[in-house]
């Protein structure tokens, strides 16, 4: 079953390469187990950036080596992606799956264009 | 008389606060005197950023204290805005006027969204 997912159109990464955005899914009821996946689309290729399954009311847990962290509140997931470089500029799509209880619901956002600018290197200290 | 003006939808300022974009106007004939104005729209307010009048084939000359510089080639104007800070993020609109010979033509672009990220300060050298 299809589900509406909202996310901001544009986000700027900080000069430290950190970008945060909210992914909100409009469910007709309260799910207990939710899976959130961040996909990156660039040059018509889609790759998975990170994913987490969480029980509503609990923290999102990404893999230890993931570049993503997040928190949830109701149907809103606050996602943070770190370690971004200018070459990572692209469309970051939020995919939400209601895993439990059945039936399964799937929602895919329109994507958040994340712009990343590499900082100028600091001058060497003498 | 109306005239079509094209400019990019989005530009990222460099970490040094410099943003460049091309403003191209589709003139029905060959003008000899052209005026280019950059307007900034933010929070429904429009302010003038800079302006220059130039003779085609010559350099654009902005005022000495202007944050803009530019070059022209045919019907294209290469504009550079410097000294930008994060608070200067906004929609920068290119306005082109064909001043001579008559008739007068006016064209206004859809605007270029310039995103600016302030750099992290470099650590103090001991």
């Amino acid at each position: 079953k299809a589900m509406h997912v909202a996310q901001p159109a544009v986000v700027l990464a900080s000069s430290r390469g950190i970008a945060s955005f909210v992914c909100e899914y409009a469910s007709p009821g309260k799910a207990t187990e939710v899976r959130v996946t961040v996909l990156r689309q660039a040059d018509s290729q889609v790759t998975e950036v990170c994913a987490a399954t969480y029980m509503t009311g609990n923290e999102l847990t990404f893999l230890d080596d993931s570049i993503c962290t997040g928190t949830s509140s109701g149907n809103q997931v606050n996602l943070t992606i770190q370690g971004l470089r200018a070459m990572d500029t692209g469309l970051y799509i939020c995919k939400v799956e209601l895993m439990y209880p059945p039936p399964y619901y799937l929602g895919i956002g329109n994507g958040t264009q994340i712009y990343v600018i590499d900082p100028e290197p600091c001058p060497d200290s003498d | 008389k109306a005239m079509h003006v094209a400019q990019p939808a989005v530009v990222l300022a460099s970490s040094r606060g410099i943003a460049s974009f091309v403003c191209e106007y589709a003139s029905p004939g060959k003008a000899t005197e052209v005026r280019v104005t950059v307007l900034r729209q933010a929070d429904s307010q429009v302010t003038e950023v800079c302006a220059a009048t130039y003779m085609t084939g010559n350099e654009l000359t902005f005022l000495d204290d202007s944050i803009c510089t530019g070059t022209s080639s045919g019907n294209q104007v290469n504009l550079t805005i410097q000294g930008l800070r994060a608070m200067d993020t906004g929609l920068y609109i290119c306005k082109v006027e064909l001043m001579y010979p008559p008739p007068y033509y006016l064209g206004i672009g859809n605007g270029t969204q310039i995103y600016v990220i302030d750099p992290e300060p470099c650590p103090d050298s001991d």
Epitope: H4, A26, S27, G29, K30, S73, G74, N75, P101 | -
Partner: antibody
Framework: QVQLQESGPGLVKPSQTLSLTCAVS?????????WNWIRQPPGKGLEWMGY???????NYNPFLKNRITISRDTSKNQFSLKLSSVTAADTAVYYC????????????WGQGTLVTVSS | DIQLTQSPSSLSASVGDRVTITCKTS??????MAWYQQKPGKAPKLLIY???ILQPGVPSRFSGSGSGTDYTFTISSLQPEDIATYYC????????FGGGTKVEIK
């Protein structure tokens, strides 16, 4: 298309037990969703009574908890309501409806059946 | 328990008018708000869920908004077929309904 249909006696005597059944077609009640009973006294608003989930677990309105039982017959793809020790205040149109999740919006409803409590 | 206060309890408006109904909850419900239309002798019909999402087939003149404890249901241009009673429902904790708003034509 999912359809729900309530059935049961239209008249129940005070102190007796009200029994209604909701037959579901177009979707298996064990495949998903929660299956609810909602009632509406004449000229008044809607009151959620309780549900049975796809997995057989129940949740009831705390105000009715000691009088209500919702069960199911998976072989007939139907679920039932029993409300004990009824009084005239239980006179209402009784609806069955479906919602997603632990709590949720009711997307499919039965047409309702009027139950009058009177001697 | 979460209490819902729906207002007004009834209203009269002309065809083409903008109609607004509000629903206030006793605590933050995280946008878990639904709106229903009920015509006389019929079962309620789900119009909107999760505060603002229209059910398939529901006309776009119906809309919902809100967050926290304050929610609004709007009919942008009242039509004769919109004569009904409208109910809000929260589904953050239990399923509870507002008292209803009866909409009539002037």
């Amino acid at each position: 298309q999912v359809q729900l249909q309530e059935s049961g006696p239209g008249l129940v005597k005070p102190s007796q037990t009200l029994s209604l059944t909701c037959a579901v077609s177009g979707y298996s009640i064990t495949s998903g969703y929660s299956w609810n009973w909602i009632r509406q006294p004449p000229g008044k608003g809607l009151e959620w009574m309780g549900y049975i989930r796809f997995d057989g677990n129940n949740n009831y309105n705390p105000f009715l908890k000691n009088r209500i039982t919702i069960s199911r017959d998976t072989s007939k793809n139907q679920f039932s309501l029993k409300l004990s020790s009824v009084t005239a205040a239980d006179t209402a149109v009784y609806y069955c409806a479906r919602n997603y999740g632990t709590w949720g919006a009711m997307d499919f409803w039965g047409q309702g059946t009027l139950v009058t409590v009177s001697s | 328990d979460i209490q819902l206060t729906q207002s007004p309890s009834s209203l009269s408006a002309s065809v083409g008018d903008r109609v607004t109904i509000t629903c206030k909850t006793s605590q933050d419900i995280n946008k878990y708000m639904a709106w229903y239309q009920q015509k006389p002798g019929k079962a309620p019909k789900l119009l909107i869920y999760y505060t603002s999402i229209l059910q398939p087939g529901v006309p776009s003149r119906f809309s919902g908004s809100g967050s926290g404890t304050d929610y609004t249901f709007t009919i942008s241009s009242l039509q004769p077929e919109d004569i009904a009673t409208y109910y809000c429902q929260q589904y953050d904790n239990l399923n509870t309904f507002g008292g209803g708003t009866k909409v009539e034509i002037k």
